[in-house]
């Protein structure tokens, strides 16, 4: 299903006749059909998408989303102001960075406006739902005749991330992988000059600032070896594809959250 973003004003409500929904065990009592589960992900602490499977509804229904933060200064109930749509009906909500408070309990409520009793509330720990952008600016340095060092950058969240490096040669059937902590560099001590190597990296918001399970996308791969440039054998750099929106597009020069803030929140 293609998902597009519209504001609520662009949403044409598809109303339908009220219908009786029953459970077969007791056809006289009205029993409420469960609402779909809401899944939220915080993308690089820049925005958050909370989505649901709109096609799990028995008919096209514009479900509404409200949210608040439990036991905090932000506990006022907020309406979604930026819905995501699939097949012309609501299928998610996008929250901007000013509405994201990683270290407060996020409460999200989905409701069927035609049947207000039909609602479901979930509580989420947003620091465990952060997905960083893919690592970028991968560079390779030859430290010695047989040793390579791979470096990369992550946008904004460097010290909060752990990384997974994968590499293989053209002769390998599978990747070799190595976990890397927040230092975002990796050394390969023994390199065979006759082989062509491919490296890629992905990152995860874990464990210093959160306990996220989801990895970023893989970086654009970088290659080294028999087929790489002969002009400068000691430095090979390949910028990762910037598939995702740039800092300017997000309209903010300020960093999303300072390192001190993140450490402070994590430890308190």
């Amino acid at each position: 299903l293609n998902t597009t973003i519209l504001t609520p004003n662009g949403n044409e409500d598809t109303t339908a006749d009220f219908f009786l929904t029953t459970m077969p065990t007791d056809s006289l009592s009205v029993s409420t059909l469960p609402l779909p589960e809401v899944q939220c992900f915080v993308f690089n602490v820049e925005y958050m998408n909370c989505t649901w499977n709109s096609s799990s509804e028995p008919q096209p229904t514009n479900l509404t989303l409200h949210y608040w933060y439990k036991n905090s200064d932000n506990d006022k109930v907020q309406k979604c102001s930026h819905y995501l749509f699939s097949e012309e009906i609501t299928s998610g909500c996008q929250l901007q960075k000013k509405e994201i408070h990683l270290y407060q309990t996020f409460v999200v409520q989905l409701q069927d406006p035609r049947e207000p009793r039909r609602q479901a509330t979930q509580m989420l720990k947003l620091q465990n739902l952060v997905i960083p952008w893919a690592p970028e600016n991968l560079t390779l340095h030859k430290l010695s005749e047989s040793q390579l060092e791979l470096n990369w950058n992550n946008r904004f969240l460097n010290h909060c991330l752990e990384h997974l490096v994968q590499y293989r040669t053209d002769w390998d059937h599978s990747w070799t992988e190595q976990s890397v902590d927040y230092r975002h560099k990796f050394s390969l001590p023994s390199v065979d000059g006759q082989k062509r190597y491919t490296f890629r990296v992905r990152s995860r918001f874990n464990p210093l600032c959160g306990s996220a399970q989801h990895w970023s996308e893989w970086s654009h791969p970088i290659h080294w070896g028999s087929n790489t440039s002969k002009e400068n054998p000691f430095l090979f750099a390949l910028e990762a594809e910037q598939k995702l929106i740039s800092e300017e597009d997000l309209g903010g020069e300020q960093k999303l959250i300072s390192e001190e803030d993140l450490h402070h929140h994590h430890h308190h």
Epitope: S55, P58, P60
Partner: antibody, heavy 119, light 108 residues
Framework: QVQLVQSGAEVKKPGASVKVSCKAS????????MHWVRQAPGQGLEWMGW????????NYAKRFQGRVTMTRDTSITTAYMELIRLRSDDTAVYYC????????????WGRGTLVTVSS | EIVLTQSPGTLSLSPGERATLSCRAS???????LAWYQQKPGQAPRLLIY???SRATGIPDRFSGSGSGTDFTLTISRLEPEDFAVYYC?????????FGQGTKVEIK
């Protein structure tokens, strides 16, 4: 293969009831709403209602409420449609139809069960 | 409920000709929620078009759907012998789901 296999033809007397079965195979039975549609001889298609096999929830068209009951047995991936107090104008082919998992149209149909109501 | 009216009731054409079938709704139907089905004698309906214009899996490209609002069209660009059947439109945007009364495409 993905299919819906329906029970055989039935002949009933007015006032009796009929229970038609629809056996699903080749897909996750509980993941798709199952609808029932009927077609009187030489006539068009008429929607009767749906059951959500995952939870057992049902929704019936107004004109059938009180006469129709849709149930399912997830252990044998089978949906049932029971129609009571049969009348001669209930003579029709009854189809089960699977609702698509990503939208609301019917992407898979059973071959139909002919129910004849005659005194 | 939304009433769908199909026209013509019967269309008599020869193989190779173009068939144009109409479906008119009593109130606006989102184009995301209109489908066309083909039914041959003694068989169950078969999905042809969903979302007003998307062909279902395995449906030849001589079948196409168009339209929005209250007026929808199914076009068969060049009739093949196996296309002679009854065609139904259906709206699935709101309960109750409703079908048109059908258009029979017969050999002239």
């Amino acid at each position: 293969q993905v299919q819906l296999v329906q029970s055989g033809a039935e002949v009933k007397k007015p006032g009796a009831s009929v229970k038609v079965s629809c056996k699903a195979s080749g897909y996750t039975f509980t993941g798709h709403y199952m609808h029932w549609v009927r077609q009187a001889p030489g006539q068009g298609l008429e929607w009767m209602g749906w059951i959500y096999p995952h939870s057992g929830h049902t929704n019936y068209a107004k004109r059938f409420q009180g006469r129709v009951t849709m149930t399912r047995d997830t252990s044998i991936t089978t949906a049932y449609m029971e129609l009571i107090r049969l009348r001669s104008d209930d003579t029709a082919v009854y189809y089960c139809a699977r609702r698509s998992g990503r939208s609301w149209y019917f992407d898979l149909w059973g071959r139909g069960t002919l129910v004849t109501v005659s005194s | 409920e939304i009433v769908l009216t199909q026209s013509p009731g019967t269309l008599s054409l020869s193989p190779g000709e173009r068939a144009t079938l109409s479906c008119r709704a009593s109130q606006s139907v989102s184009s995301s929620y209109l489908a066309w089905y083909q039914q041959k004698p003694g068989q169950a309906p078969r999905l042809l078009i969903y979302g007003a214009s998307s062909r279902a899996t395995g449906i030849p490209d001589r079948f196409s759907g168009s339209g929005s609002g209250t007026d929808f069209t199914l076009t068969i660009s060049r009739l093949e012998p196996e296309d002679f059947a009854v065609y139904y439109c259906q709206q699935y945007g709101s309960s109750p789901w409703t079908f048109g009364q059908g258009t029979k495409v017969e050999i002239k």
